[in-house]
Amino acid sequence: HKCDITLQEIIKTLNSLTEQKTLCTELTVTDIFAASKNTTEKETFCRAATVLRQFYSHHEKDTRCLGATAQQFHRHKQLIRFLKRLDRNLWGLAGLNSCPVKEANQSTLENFLERLKTIMREKYSKCSS
């Protein structure tokens, strides 16, 4: 079966986001990947989207991320814009209304995105072969 166009869009967005780092990609998020043994693929996507939504809702107007200059502000807007796109596409792939995120473990957003990219690339390699 063919790879979903949404999956390709997610990988493309993750490739862009992991090309460079900002001050705020070093902030922490819930690490849903730490213990995801008994989690279905759809649940993983749903929970990843939830984590991203929590992050950008909390940090969209965070002065530490917005910075002091127009250039820093533009950078942060870029980050939020790409995270929102990722969130939207992950919800589309998950097809679930909601999912709990209860883990205590934390990782940086940067590491979270790298891990998510690995998972998405693995999924892509399976569906394209």
Epitope: K12, Q20, Q71, L79
Partner: antibody
Framework: EVQLVESGGGLVQPGGSLRLSCAAS????????MHWVRQAPGKGLEWVVW????????TYADDFKGRFTISLDNSKNTAYLQMNSLRAEDTAVYYC???????????WGQGTLVTVSS | EIVLTQSPATLSLSPGERATLSCKAS??????AAWYQQKPGQAPRLLIY???HRYTGIPARFSGSGSGTDFTLTISSLEPEDFAVYYC?????????FGQGTKVEIK
């Protein structure tokens, strides 16, 4: 593969005008800002302008305000640099460069040479 | 505008040697400094952004450090292909500005 291709350079007389084009491919054009940077023969790099490709908002270096205008055609994935009232000191290779997602300029065109001379 | 001053103007070294390039800003740019490499007849290439982060595909022998007004690009062991001109650049605030460049030449 990301590619930026400049065109429109050439010989122009002092006081004349020229429009440079930068055709982008291999990525979503409106996701990344676009810059123009120039380099006079044997000299260093000089930043000219950048444009937010999502909003169309430009930011110019002071020396170029009024004489140079950056614009976009998002349907063609192309950025333009309109240069008016050209002077001999505007002679340079003009590069377009994609702004990195957050920092710097991560992809550059091959450059196009503008020569202002009578 | 923020002025960036690079030193030395020219660095004469042999392959295998360590190169240390300096860039000083006229006011603080926090960590918003980048480094580019340019070879004759070619466009510049992004090496380092955000002071110390290597861009995708850049070899580990290139490293950046510093903060505020003082920044350094280090090439731990020069390869033949590293002989080029290096520019620092700030993207802390508009107008973005470049240093005048440091030429790394073969001794």
């Amino acid at each position: 593969e990301v590619q930026l291709v400049e065109s429109g350079g050439g010989l122009v007389q002092p006081g004349g005008s020229l429009r440079l084009s930068c055709a982008a491919s291999g990525y979503t054009f409106t996701d990344y800002s676009m810059h123009w940077v120039r380099q006079a023969p044997g000299k260093g790099l000089e930043w000219v302008v950048w444009i937010n490709t999502e909003t169309g908002e430009p930011t110019y270096a002071d020396d170029f305000k009024g004489r140079f205008t950056i614009s976009l055609d998002n349907s063609k994935n192309t950025a333009y640099l309109q240069m008016n009232s050209l002077r001999a000191e505007d002679t340079a290779v003009y590069y377009c460069a994609r702004g990195g997602i957050f920092y710097g300029m991560d992809y550059w065109g091959q450059g196009t040479l503008v020569t202002v001379s009578s | 505008e923020i002025v960036l001053t690079q030193s030395p103007a020219t660095l004469s070294l042999s392959p295998g040697e360590r190169a240390t390039l300096s860039c000083k800003a006229s006011q603080s740019v926090i960590n918003d400094a980048a480094w580019y490499q340019q070879k004759p007849g070619q466009a510049p290439r992004l090496l380092i952004y955000y002071t110390s982060h290597r861009y995708t595909g850049i070899p580990a022998r290139f490293s950046g450090s510093g903060s505020g007004t003082d920044f350094t690009l280090t090439i731990s062991s020069l390869e033949p292909e590293d002989f080029a001109v290096y520019y620092c650049q700030q993207d802390y605030t508009s107008p973005w500005t470049f240093g005048q460049g440091t030429k790394v030449e073969i001794k």
